[in-house]
């Protein structure tokens, strides 16, 4: 009956008012709909202004829903990042604390007079872990070279050892292995362990950053129209009880989120690579074993130097000549001190295993985040009809939705009946984020193979919207020279989502 309640606009008035809009705009009864730009032009309860307001609102609601979903994912990634970062930092800090507690007693002045060099090494390891563009092998080589000079001087207080003699010592030392196997072992293990730890944590940071940046990508005008039609046109057309047909909703959101779905392949690759690299957290070259035991390699090295001292000295003098004796006398009587070694293998605390199993489960859960987003938003945010039946809203009326559901991604939207998508114009922000995912995946794959990766290589593509994995304070180009070591200043490097200096946390 044309004069029945369906002709009145009471329900629309109620919904419209609940959204905070002025009720004075709402007609008392249906009016002719030639003025409608988005909804079908039958009799309607919506004026042009109402249609525009509802279109803007539906657009905002979808963006909010999208951001909410992204925020949940970001929060999960940020929590993971913080947990792993805390754990890795804790391992390194623990090792340094053990060194500071045990080395003075174990090695006396051989340690206390070089405490700065050891402190610097831990700072460099921290910087390296934070993603600074330090070459770890070079950093370690410089540390050993500097330490050898200082210890050689200390072990030979009776000799005058000018810089040119120390340079010669350094050249001789390469073949003599004064610290035994410790430097080589530490280099091999630390490179693998630190690169695994830092690339994993950086992977979490990049993933979180990508989600954040993609959530900020605006939805286009064609999407706005389609969402308005999906969500509010049923109200305007006098069928307010009709919920959107599920396939109709999916087509709208697949069209709206076509670019986002193109992240899927590289997103999966990244998460797979992250899960894979956790294999490198175990065993004798594993993260926990190595990062937590740096001090034991250092103790072994000093012991080896003391054990090899006579042979080393003889060969250095043979190669570099007899240096002058100290003009002020032979120095104190030597007291050789051997550091008692703690076991190198740290018994696993169980913390890392727990973190890894949680991370693996959560990363698997979000692997299909981008392609499942349309379905998730439809089912969670769009109050869909429970079945594809004749009673759901199909965009034109209450009835069956006949078009097939589109595939995922931009290319598959060429014939999307609900959203006009220009598949020749991919969103640039999303393309850049795909590139960031690829770069990070490559880093993780290199890290899996134990290779130190130059973290500068692709952290700036010139676009101004990278993934936050670049370096602060010119750190990436930082190279430490042996001679300038005494005047180093602490520098910071930001991992995405973290701000930290020398292991001190600030949330």
């Amino acid at each position: 009956d044309p004069a029945s309640k369906s002709r009145s606009c009471g329900e629309v008035r109620q919904i419209y008012g609940a959204k905070g809009f002025s009720l004075s705009d709402v007609p008392q009864a249906e009016i002719s709909g030639e003025h409608l730009r988005i909804c079908p032009q039958g009799y309607t309860c919506c004026t042009s202004e109402m249609e525009e307001n509802l279109a803007n609102r539906s657009h905002a609601e979808l963006e909010t829903a999208l951001r909410d979903s992204s925020r949940v994912l970001q929060a999960m990634l940020a929590t993971q990042l913080r947990s792993f970062d805390d754990h890795f930092q804790h391992l390194l800090n623990d090792s340094e604390r053990t060194l500071q507690a045990t080395f003075p007693g174990a090695f006396g002045e051989l340690y206390t007079q070089n405490a700065r060099a050891f402190r610097d090494l831990y700072s460099e390891l921290r910087l390296y872990y934070r993603g600074a563009n330090l070459h770890l092998e070079e950093t370690l080589a410089e540390f050993w070279a500097r330490l050898l000079e200082r210890l050689f001087k200390q072990l030979h207080p009776q000799l005058l050892l000018p810089d040119d003699y120390l340079d010669c010592l350094g050249k001789q030392a390469e073949a003599l292995r004064p610290f035994g196997e410790a430097p080589r072992e530490l280099r091999l293990r630390a490179t693998r362990a630190f690169v695994a730890a830092r690339s994993f944590v950086q992977g979490l940071g990049v993933a979180s950053d990508v989600v954040r940046k993609v959530a900020q990508v605006p939805l286009g005008p064609e999407c706005s129209r389609a969402v308005m039609k999906l969500v509010y046109c049923a109200h305007c057309l006098g069928v307010p009880g009709a919920r959107p047909c599920p396939d109709y909703c999916r087509n709208v959101l697949k069209g709206c989120l076509a670019n986002q779905a193109d992240l899927d392949a590289e997103w999966r690759n990244l998460l797979d690579s992250m899960v894979l690299i956790t294999d490198k957290f175990w065993g004798t070259s594993g993260v926990e074993s190595v990062i937590g035991s740096v001090h034991t390699w250092l103790a072994e090295a000093i012991n080896a130097l003391q054990d090899n001292r006579d042979t080393l000295t003889a060969k250095v003098i043979q190669g570099c000549g007899n240096p002058k004796v100290n003009p002020q006398g032979p120095g104190p009587e030597e007291k050789r001190r051997r550091g008692k070694l703690a076991p190198r293998e740290r018994p696993p605390s169980g913390t890392l295993e727990k973190l890894v199993s949680e991370a693996k489960a959560q990363l698997r859960d979000v692997q299909d985040f981008w392609i499942s987003l349309p379905g998730t938003l439809c089912s969670e945010k769009m109050a869909l009809s429970t079945a594809s039946d004749d009673r759901c809203w199909n965009g034109m009326a209450r009835g069956r939705y006949l078009p097939e559901v589109m595939g995922d991604g931009l290319a598959n939207q060429i014939n999307n009946p609900e959203v006009e998508v220009d598949i020749t114009k991919p969103d640039m922000t999303i393309r850049q984020q795909i590139m960031q995912l690829k770069i990070m995946t490559n880093r993780l794959r290199s890290a899996y193979n134990g290779n130190d990766v130059d973290f500068q290589d692709a952290s700036d593509d010139g676009s101004g919207s990278g993934s936050g994995d670049g370096c602060l304070d010119d750190l990436c180009s930082r190279k430490v020279s042996r001679k300038s070591s005494s005047s180093r200043t602490p520098l910071t490097h930001a991992l995405p989502g973290l701000s930290e200096q020398e292991g001190q946390k600030t949330s």
């Epitope: 009776q158 000295t313 003009p327």
Partner: antibody
Framework: QIQLVQSGPELKKPGETVKISCKAS????????MNWVKQAPGKGLRWMGW????????TYTDDFKGRFAFSLETSASTAFLQINNLRNEDTATYFC???????????WGQGTLVTVSS | DIQMTQSPASLSASVGETVTITCRAS??????LAWYQQKQGKSPQLLVY???TLADGVPSRFSGSGSGTQYSLKINSLQPEDFGTYYC?????????FGGGTKLEIK
């Protein structure tokens, strides 16, 4: 040329103190430590230790810790050896010596004979 | 401490002969070894430093050799003024100890 000139012979009773001097010339006094060497009659040379002429810090070998004291008067380029509570076994010639850059004592004082007798 | 052991403790030789005195260190002294000659009532005189380098004014008939822990002083064609007591001394580490001495007498 470099010279080390020591004070003359001393005759002391047990329990007394003796202080002998060694005046250096011909080089910058504070550039090299001053060493002291003991030689008992008919015996070999024994290195007693040295004094850092920059800091004035003395270092004694184990056999000469306690009653022996090295000191300086830098302004006069002079080093001193003092022996307290003298014993008969302290009877010896005491030499001051300066070492060379690569080891060895090319420069010696003429020696000071200290005789301890009651 | 590094101990220095000299041998022989005494030795008789004739003018024109060649003699060798040896010095053994209880640890490697890395060539930081000196030889002295001392005549009765005189200060010692440096002959050799860094095991083989002759000190200024020392005749070439004197020569030093050795490495590690074993060192020797050789005197070719002994001259009358060469008789006296010879000492080795290491300069490697604290303390800079002397050997016990070798008394070289005319036969």
């Amino acid at each position: 040329q470099i010279q080390l000139v020591q004070s003359g012979p001393e005759l002391k009773k047990p329990g007394e103190t003796v202080k002998i001097s060694c005046k250096a010339s011909g080089y910058a006094f504070t550039d090299y430590s001053m060493n002291w060497v003991k030689q008992a009659p008919g015996k070999g040379l024994r290195w007693m230790g040295w004094i850092n002429t920059e800091t004035g810090e003395p270092t004694y070998t184990d056999d000469f810790k306690g009653r022996f004291a090295f000191s300086l008067e830098t302004s006069a380029s002079t080093a001193f050896l003092q022996i307290n509570n003298l014993r008969n076994e302290d009877t010896a010639t005491y030499f001051c010596a300066r070492h060379y850059d690569y080891g060895g004592f090319p420069y010696w004082g003429q020696g000071t004979l200290v005789t301890v007798s009651s | 401490d590094i101990q220095m052991t000299q041998s022989p403790a005494s030795l008789s030789a004739s003018v024109g002969e060649t003699v060798t005195i040896t010095c053994r260190a209880s640890g490697n002294v890395h060539n930081y070894l000196a030889w002295y000659q001392q005549k009765q009532g005189k200060s010692p005189q440096l002959l050799v430093y860094t095991a083989k380098t002759l000190a200024d004014g020392v005749p070439s008939r004197f020569s030093g050799s050795g490495s590690g822990t074993q060192y020797s002083l050789k005197i070719n064609s002994l001259q009358p003024e060469d008789f006296g007591t010879y000492y080795c001394q290491h300069f490697w580490s604290n303390p800079w100890t002397f050997g016990g001495g070798t008394k070289l007498e005319i036969k």
